[in-house]
């Protein structure tokens, strides 16, 4: 018996179609992904074969305006017009909190959302009992097929779940779950999940009775054979693991932002073991057309889109400085006020011992790309923010050592006066240089902001330490030059949508007025 | 032929214990979940356990668990229902039933059952 | 729990009427029913599986229908041999539950 499973993660709000890089989509004849492709395959291939399922292995919340205005609202409508089968639950579907999960996408899903690990207690228990489930046995032809959730158990660290959902180990959580849909005689099992490819690995190891993993959350581009677009594969498509009872457990990402579809084949034997797998993701480039019917539907929750772009969202009592005469030289208030923001947006898990788990960012200058004139009433609408941050990225938390901290620092100055994007604007740290002295040793001070205190106050970087960091996840990948970041990062989890992160934080505080600080010196 | 065969009921006094036993033929036991389904007099039927077919998994209703113990002896063909701390409302008469292997269980063996009265 | 409540408690009916039970389930359970037929002294017999699917054997005059949390047994023509009690079965979850019984009784 030979099942078809399509699949995607991390989608991020691209129900548009986008650029090759995920961004805004500019010239349309060569850009890729969006719902309405999406949906042109899906049913192609639904029409080809027999036995089809489409999962989402979570993630679909944040990462471009159309979350912002909408809220879930648009994932919930499109995926049930696309028909998904089975979606699991990301960290970042957390975003608005629990409400922001259930009312847009929970109640409205026509299709199970899934996590065995979530559980939740109090009185949300009530709530939103039978909203979200462990897992979901789905017939599919004359068979049936069990689908079991898992998300990132370090999602109250990522989002806002609040404190009555209680997010426990994947492998402690799916297996009761898997024993007992083997006891319901369901014999082939898919642990659908966000918590990235070395969990999904763990869970292929570990997990006895599950025949495939599915998985999100790190992004990983898998594919076997010639890579059809820019993405490196982390390995072939699908990853086989060997599981500790000796089974052979095939293991599927397909990269993120709706630019490919996972496509995967496995045959089953009549006692529900695996015979064979395999497939490719399938770019969805211009060459695959936009379904009419779903672009119209897009075209017209648009509307909406360019209406909100142009709303006040706050005000600002002073220039915001985001030219880059300023913030690749030396301190700026727009690279204060970014910073700031990303901080704030990473406010959570205050217990007695820190008063926040992270207190640090850095941003490279090159990033920001407009400032704000208070002149014209001083507004700040989502339009002069897209100006400052035009490249669609997020702002992410990263583990890092002290030791790589402060190579960042030297690659900062490392060619300091040439006008270039690597010179870094800061929160929670203050950094002097001393640029007489030689490239690789212009860092005397580095002194960062203390988490495991009641009072924050500056204490002195330690080499071997490990600190958390909230950056772009354009420096988190080592762009623009600092490589040392993406070689020896311990930990990376994606973050919020980085327009959004600063819009929220402006209308939060309503009237801002960032200086310069002596952050940098 | 298909069939199974229970074995071990009788009268108990409350407090005690009893172990019923159902012996299987006719088809390859070890392929099977196997399931124990009571029926008090004069009432309907109630779904005690369930031992999955190599024995690791096993689930139990609420008014019996942590007083009955299912297990199976694939080698014998067996299948046992360890009964302790018997009260009188577990006065019943006591089937074993093979749940088939697709989804979702429904039984399509049952056994002719044993009656199990509890009662000072 | 899942729990399944049949109606009615009883029927009474002659040969050759058309019976129809039903069997509600307290939460979406699909198309995961099945149903049985008792008589006196005699162990269940499996008559319906997944809501509708006849199990080998059994006179076409037993069919099933429904979905979700609303389900039917239909006897489309009474025979002398169907006079006995019905239940309907839930293997969505555990624990597995019937229903409380339909008793088909000689008008």
């Known amino acids: 018996w030979e099942l078809t499973i399509l699949h995607t993660n991390d989608v991020h709000s691209r129900l548009e179609q986008t650029s090759e890089d995920s961004s805004k989509c500019v010239n349309a004849s060569r850009c890729m992904g969006g719902v309405a492709r999406l949906f042109t395959k899906v049913q192609q291939i639904r029409r080809a074969e027999p036995n089809v399922l489409l999962l989402d292995a979570g993630d679909q919340y944040q990462g471009t305006i159309w979350f912002t205005v909408y809220k879930g609202a648009e994932v919930a409508h499109f995926m049930n017009a696309l028909r998904y089968d089975a979606m699991a639950l990301g960290n970042h579907e957390f975003d608005n909190g629990v409400e922001g999960l259930i009312e847009p996408l929970l109640k409205e899903a026509k299709f199970p959302i899934l996590s065995a690990n979530i559980k939740a207690k109090g009185p949300l228990a009530s709530q939103i009992s039978g909203l979200y489930l462990p897992y979901k046995v789905l017939p599919v032809g004359d068979e049936v097929v069990g689908i079991v959730g898992y998300t990132s158990k370090e999602t109250p660290f990522l989002s806002n779940p609040g404190t009555n959902l209680v997010f426990e180990d994947e492998i402690t959580a799916l297996q009761p779950e898997v024993d007992k849909l083997k006891t319901l005689n369901v014999n082939k099992i898919i642990a659908l999940g966000h918590s990235g490819f070395e969990t999904d690995k763990l869970i292929a190891q570990k997990v006895r009775g599950v025949d495939v993993v599915v998985g999100g959350h790190s992004n990983t581009f898998l594919y076997t054979g010639n890579p059809p677009s820019k993405e490196v594969p982390a390995g072939k498509y699908p990853f086989i693991v060997t599981s500790d009872d000796g089974r052979k457990v095939p293991v599927v990402q397909a990269y993120a932002f709706g630019k490919y579809l996972g496509y995967l084949k496995i045959e089953f034997d009549e006692r529900g073991n695996v015979i064979s797998s395999h497939g490719n993701p399938i770019l969805l480039n211009s060459s695959i057309p936009e379904d009419p019917s779903i672009k119209a539907d897009i075209n017209k929750w648009r509307i909406k889109l360019d209406n909100y772009s142009t709303q006040e969202l706050g005000k600002t009592i002073v220039y915001l400085d985001g030219s880059s005469q300023s913030c690749r030289f030396r301190e700026c208030n727009m690279g204060n006020l970014i910073c700031d923001a990303m901080i704030n947006n990473n406010l959570r898990h205050a217990d007695e011992m820190f008063w926040n788990h992270v207190s640090m960012c850095i941003l490279n200058g090159g990033g920001i790309r407009s400032p704000i004139d208070e002149r014209n009433n001083g507004t700040i609408t989502w339009e002069n923010l897209a100006a400052v941050l035009p490249f669609g990225g997020t702002f992410d938390l990263v583990q890092l050592k002290g030791s790589t901290l402060k190579k960042a620092f030297e690659h900062s100055v490392h060619r300091y006066g040439q006008s270039t994007g690597e010179f870094l604007q800061v929160g929670g740290i203050h950094v002097v240089y001393d640029l007489s002295r030689k490239p690789g040793d212009r860092v005397v001070k580095l002194d960062v902001l203390c988490t495991k205190c009641r009072v924050p106050s500056y204490d002195p970087l330690k080499m071997d330490e490990i600190y958390k960091v909230i950056l772009p996840n354009f420096l988190a990948n080592g762009g623009d030059g600092f490589q040392m970041i993406k070689d020896e990062l311990l930990r990376h989890d994606s973050g919020d949508q980085d327009i959004n992160v600063v819009s929220t934080y402006i209308s939060k505080m309503k009237v801002i007025y960032p200086a310069v600080e002596g952050r940098i010196k | 032929q298909v069939q199974l065969v229970e074995s071990g009921g009788g009268v108990v006094q409350p407090g005690r214990s009893l172990r019923l036993s159902c012996a299987a033929s006719?088809?390859?036991?070890?392929?099977?979940?196997m399931h124990w389904v009571r029926q008090a007099p004069g009432k309907g039927l109630e779904w005690v356990a369930v031992i999955s077919d190599e024995g690791s998994n096993k689930y139990y209703a609420d008014s019996v668990k942590g007083r009955f113990t299912i297990s199976r002896d694939n080698s014998k063909n067996t299948l046992y229902l360890q009964m302790n701390s018997l009260r009188a409302e577990d006065t019943a008469v006591y089937y074993c039933a093979r749940g088939w292997l697709r989804y979702p269980i429904a039984f399509d063996i049952w056994g002719q059952g044993t009656m199990v009265t509890v009662s000072s | 729990d899942i729990q399944l409540t049949q109606s009615p408690s009883s029927v009474s009916a002659s040969v050759g009427d058309r019976v129809t039970i039903t069997c509600r389930a307290s939460?979406?359970?699909?198309?995961?029913l099945a149903w049985y037929q008792q008589k006196p002294g005699k162990a269940p017999k499996l008559l319906i599986y997944a809501a509708s699917s006849l199990q080998s054997g059994v006179p076409s005059r037993f069919s099933g229908s429904g979905s979700g949390t609303d389900f039917t047994l239909t006897i489309s023509s009474l025979q002398p041999e169907d006079f006995a009690t019905y239940y309907c079965?839930?293997?969505?979850?555990?624990?597995?539950?019937f229903g409380g019984g339909t008793k088909v009784e000689i008008k």
């Open positions: 006719g088809f390859t036991f070890s392929h099977y979940g």
């Open positions: 079965q839930q293997a969505n979850d555990f624990p597995i539950t």
């Open positions: 939460q979406d359970i699909s198309s995961w």
